[in-house]
């Protein structure tokens, strides 16, 4: 049976999967696939690690935790309804039929539609869907995607809004640039 996880369209989905390395650096291969875990391997592989590194991945799929520590949780970026379905996390432990298999059901809900704000007081309201959840689990630290173009009249307001905000750090860390003009 699979365990169900939920995300909204436009958000990042988080599918947790872990194992305990036998010893530090003694990693085992892991694969993530779309569809329930088959008898061997993963079907429709979206990401794979070996004993040293992530050796295969497709766009929008990445490991946010440190896989060298056994955190092989999958993040799917900017999900759509088409991302719904069952995902397989397979810990490929050496030996016959030793693999650990986890079937995770991802349910994507339509994005909540919020009315346009009358005053653009905060950054998320001013630039909807610019913030995506990135990190370990739901309601995690938020990082910025690409910044929209911002004209001169918005600059000072935006700067004031950001000054005491944690978003200021995220802006800096994201390497986003503000274009004037």
């Amino acid at each position: 049976s699979e365990v169900e996880y939920r995300a909204e369209v436009g958000q990042n989905a988080y599918l947790p999967c872990f194992y305990t390395p036998a010893a530090p650096g003694n990693l085992v291969p892991v694969c993530w696939g779309k569809g329930a875990c088959p008898v061997f391997e993963c079907g429709n592989v979206v990401l794979r690690t070996d004993e040293r590194d992530v050796n295969y991945w497709t766009s929008r799929y990445w490991l946010n935790g440190d896989f060298r520590k056994g955190d092989v949780s999958l993040t799917i970026e900017n999900v759509t309804l088409a991302d719904s379905g069952i995902y397989c996390c397979r810990i490929q432990i050496p030996g016959i039929m030793n693999d650990e298999k986890f079937n995770l059901k991802l349910v994507i809900k339509p994005a909540k539609v919020t009315p346009a704000p009358t005053r653009q007081r905060d950054f998320t309201a001013a630039f909807p869907r610019m913030l995506t959840t990135r990190g370990h689990g739901p309601a995690e630290t938020q990082t910025l995607g690409s910044l929209p173009d911002i004209n001169l009249t918005q600059i000072s307001t935006l700067a004031n809004e950001l000054r005491d905000s944690r978003l200021a750090n995220d802006l800096r860390d994201s390497g986003a640039t503000i274009r004037i003009g």
Partner: antibody, heavy 117, light 107 residues
Amino acid sequence: EVQLQQSGAELVKPGASVKLSCTASGFNIKDFYMHWVHQRTEKGLEWIGRIDPEDGKTKYAPKFQGKATITADTSSNTAYLQLSSLTSEDTAVYYCARSNPYFFDYWGQGTTLTVSS
Amino acid sequence: DIQMNQSPSSLSASLGDTITITCHASQTINVWLSWYQQKPGNIPKLLIYKASNLHTGVPSRFSGSGSGTGFTLNISSLQPEDIATYYCHQGQSYPYTFGGGTKLEIK
């Protein structure tokens, strides 16, 4: 043998800051997440946050954001917890713990922090 | 945040009894749950990880089960040394959270 040795008891005044240490032996902290958990007298366990000593990245419980700062020094195999603007509410036992990766398999002996004027 | 609702908060049982402690997660945590024992004046000690795996050196009288949102810790043939407070913990998502604890006393 894996051990986590924490610094000794602290008695500090309200408004002050304190830095607690947790020195690991028997393993390299770079290979594990290091966490801090606190426990008030006769109360339950509460997770403060963690650090990945390999890259210095941290996670905090919302309640401790701005109050706690977790750092690590891999050369001395030590994790630190700094607590600022202390009040009597911060009086508690503070534990460091190693996770592997989603459960705590080893704990320090605890550091008692007393905030009193 | 994922809330961990642990019950009962206290429990009194006789030596030799079998007792059950339950933990309910506010959202699915699959099997990423562990149980800890804290004896009076001592540090917490890992009993069970991944919902049902017994940690090295823990007596087989302890067992865990569950998946998704509902979990149980069973202690069979209760011994005097089992007097302690027991905590569940979810390690799936940050911020990590613990149950409120169950204080076990012997009648």
